[in-house]
């Protein structure tokens, strides 16, 4: 284990209700704007203070968003992903992948292109 970084990858369904200022987060990624090498996925880059996502508390910077209201986010241009969120309606269901760094733990996933730096 020494000299190796391990990650525990989990998935979660997060249901957000759009607040007065929206969902309250930023994203990076897309086929035209890869955030992680060889991965065109959509990642959370900022959680805005007092926004819907921050108040819910589960979505974290660095999370990968796999789907919105059941619609897969694979192979989307960045702006198309942004538009998908903006048009997602009042109740928004997000399928997200959390990636937690673990210190020499027995359970983990060897991470390549780590989005958390």
């Amino acid at each position: 284990m020494n000299g190796r970084v391990d990650y525990l990858v989990t998935e979660e369904e997060i249901n957000l209700t759009r607040g007065p200022s929206g969902l309250g987060f930023n994203i990076v990624g897309g086929t035209d704007q890869q955030y992680v090498s060889n991965d065109s996925g959509i990642y959370v880059s900022r959680i805005k203070e007092n926004g819907a996502a921050a108040l819910d508390g589960r979505l974290q910077e660095g999370d990968k968003i796999l789907s919105v209201n059941g619609q897969d986010l694979k192979n989307l241009l960045h702006q198309d992903a942004v538009d998908l969120f903006r048009n997602a309606g009042y109740a928004v269901s997000l399928r997200v992948q959390h990636r937690l760094q673990v210190q020499n733990g027995p359970i983990g996933h060897r991470g390549e292109g780590d989005p958390s730096g």
Epitope: N26, V28, V44, S45, R46, Q79
Partner: nanobody, 128 residues
Framework: DVQLVESGGGLVQAGGSLRLSCAAS????????MGWFRQRPGKERDVVAT????????YYLDSVKGRFTISRDNAKNTVFLQMNSLKPEDTAVYYC??????????????????????WGQGTQVTVS
Amino acid sequence: DVQLVESGGGLVQAGGSLRLSCAASGRPFSSLDMGWFRQRPGKERDVVATINWTGDSTYYLDSVKGRFTISRDNAKNTVFLQMNSLKPEDTAVYYCAARGGGSSVDSEYDVGEFEYYYWGQGTQVTVS
């Protein structure tokens, strides 16, 4: 979390120049909006200059426009503040700051324009 380490501060005569650097680690630098803030003696901390994650949008405090230039080097995970024609009133502790960049999923307008939440320890700039 993001760690920020500033360098380049010091004592300089009025009219002189300094270049501040801020090295970031902890997450991909290219996804971060970066900024320089300063706190002058007995004053609130003010934004001096900011640069967005893509490097194509900058902001400057009116009193530093034309004298200070903010830039970033994504290959080196570093943001710079080139300060020319320094004045005694530029004396302050200068702080590097960061926040997640990216596109808002809500609207083009970004509420809380100077809402930064990762901070360096600061570097002293004294202009005599």
